[in-house]
């Protein structure tokens, strides 16, 4: 069961809007594994698949350890809003065998803008700046196959997963130093 | 059959460090954090920190920061726990447990691995 | 850190009867519609087993007579009616926040 909807409650406690921005992205993360798992039954991914146009994991050794709040909501906003154009990108050009799962991808899609609209807010509560990402946005194209979209569809699911427990587990860190 | 296997007991001098490792099978191994619980006796179970097997760092539980170190070597599948500066105290069985990403709750656990640190 | 208080620290009660475990924290550990609060057996000798996460989920494999409840600060595990292998020390966890941490055991004793 996902949180309720509705307007975020108006806080200035840091706590408080860090805790919920951990709530709808650990519901996010639920969803995710559930979609992944969703896939894997449906279309059997043959080992790890990647996209060029994803981006880089937000994770190498000892990152966590020297986080610093501005950082990961900075990166994770960017990152966030590649994995919705990725997501938008599936729906639209994912093809017939994807159908089935647009249900759920319409739902994840809605949780992920919720997400960013509450880190959005955050952001902005703690007056850091909006920043807009480094890289440019590589125009992403149609799948070369249905093999293809599939195979993009795991590549999306998989690295949102990973970036999601990434932040939750950056953001709880973050916490326990505020 | 999804399974966490820990490397023997170790019986240590204080001051030493002992390196625990905990291979895991049955399952894809960078789809869940590996998490290690320490069980003293007499004490309740305590988190020591955990590591996203994929690339992510460690985090740890306050009280161990500085002296556990969690690393994972993925292409083994396998997860290491170092404590370092051991003190009487650090007796103790000590578990590594599959962690679902985000959750913090533990499906999995190795058999545990005993450490006795004594002169 | 959220400290777990479990209640009673043991209790004998005869195999076919129910227990009722209880786990309180220091502070809600629930949040719009999520409890962070998960059960485990342990038996001696062995390693803790996972019976209930997020306060009411069945893991994998665990017996229908295995149950949770509650939500903020207060919860419950219950064993409908007990089985001779259900008599081991039972741990609350919670992961409301960072560090995890657990209770500090009930152990169920056969009367």
């Known amino acids: 069961p996902g949180p309720p909807a509705g307007s975020p409650r108006v806080s200035s406690d840091p706590r408080a809007d860090l805790d919920s921005a951990v709530l709808l992205t650990r519901s996010l993360l639920a969803d995710t594994r559930q979609l992944a798992a969703q896939m894997r039954d449906k279309f059997p991914a043959d080992g790890d698949h990647s996209l060029d146009s994803l981006p880089t994991l937000a994770m190498s050794a000892g990152t966590l350890g020297s986080l610093q709040l501005p950082g990961v909501l900075t990166r994770l906003r960017v990152d966030l809003m590649s994995y919705l154009r990725h997501v938008q990108w599936l729906r639209r050009a994912g093809g017939p065998s994807l159908k089935t799962l647009e249900p759920e991808l319409g739902a994840l899609q809605a949780r992920l803008e919720r997400l960013l609209r509450r880190l959005q807010l955050l952001m902005s509560r703690l007056a850091l700046p909006q920043a807009a990402p480094d890289q440019p946005v590589i125009p992403l194209g149609p799948p070369a196959s249905a093999w293809g979209s599939i195979r993009a569809a795991h590549a999306i699911l998989g690295g949102l997963h990973l970036t999601l427990d990434w932040a939750v587990r950056g953001l709880l860190l973050l916490k326990t130093r505020l | 059959e999804v399974q966490l296997v820990q490397s023997g007991a170790e019986v240590k001098k204080p001051g030493a460090s002992v390196k625990i490792s905990c291979k895991a099978s049955?399952?894809?191994?960078?789809?869940?954090?590996m998490d290690w619980v320490k069980q003293a006796p007499g004490q309740r179970l305590e988190w020591i920190g955990d590591?996203?097997?994929?690339?992510?760092?460690?985090i740890y539980n306050q009280k161990f920061t500085g002296r556990a170190t969690l690393t994972v070597d993925k292409s083994a599948s396998t997860a290491y726990m170092e404590l370092s500066s051991l003190r009487s105290e650090d007796t103790a069985v000590y578990y590594c447990?599959?962690?679902?990403?985000?959750?913090?709750?533990?499906?999995?656990w190795g058999q545990g691995t005993t450490v006795t640190v004594s002169s | 850190d959220i400290v777990l208080t479990q209640s009673p620290a043991s209790l004998a009660l005869s195999p076919g009867e129910r227990a009722t475990l209880s786990c309180r924290a220091s502070k809600s550990v629930s949040t719009s519609g999520y409890s962070y609060i998960h059960w485990y057996q342990q038996k001696p000798g062995q390693a803790p087993r996972l019976l209930i996460y997020l306060a009411s989920n069945l893991a994998s494999g665990v017996p229908a007579r295995f149950s949770g409840s509650g939500s903020g600060t207060d919860f419950t595990l219950t064993i409908s009616s007990l089985e001779e292998e259900d008599f081991a020390t039972y741990y609350c966890?919670?992961?409301?926040?960072?560090?995890?941490?657990f209770g500090q055991g009930t152990k169920l004793e056969i009367k």
């Open positions: 590591i996203n097997p994929h690339g992510g760092g460690p």
């Open positions: 049955g399952y894809t191994f960078t789809d869940y954090n």
């Open positions: 447990a599959r962690g679902e990403l985000g959750h913090w709750y533990f499906d999995v």
């Open positions: 966890q919670h992961s409301r926040d960072l560090p995890p941490t």
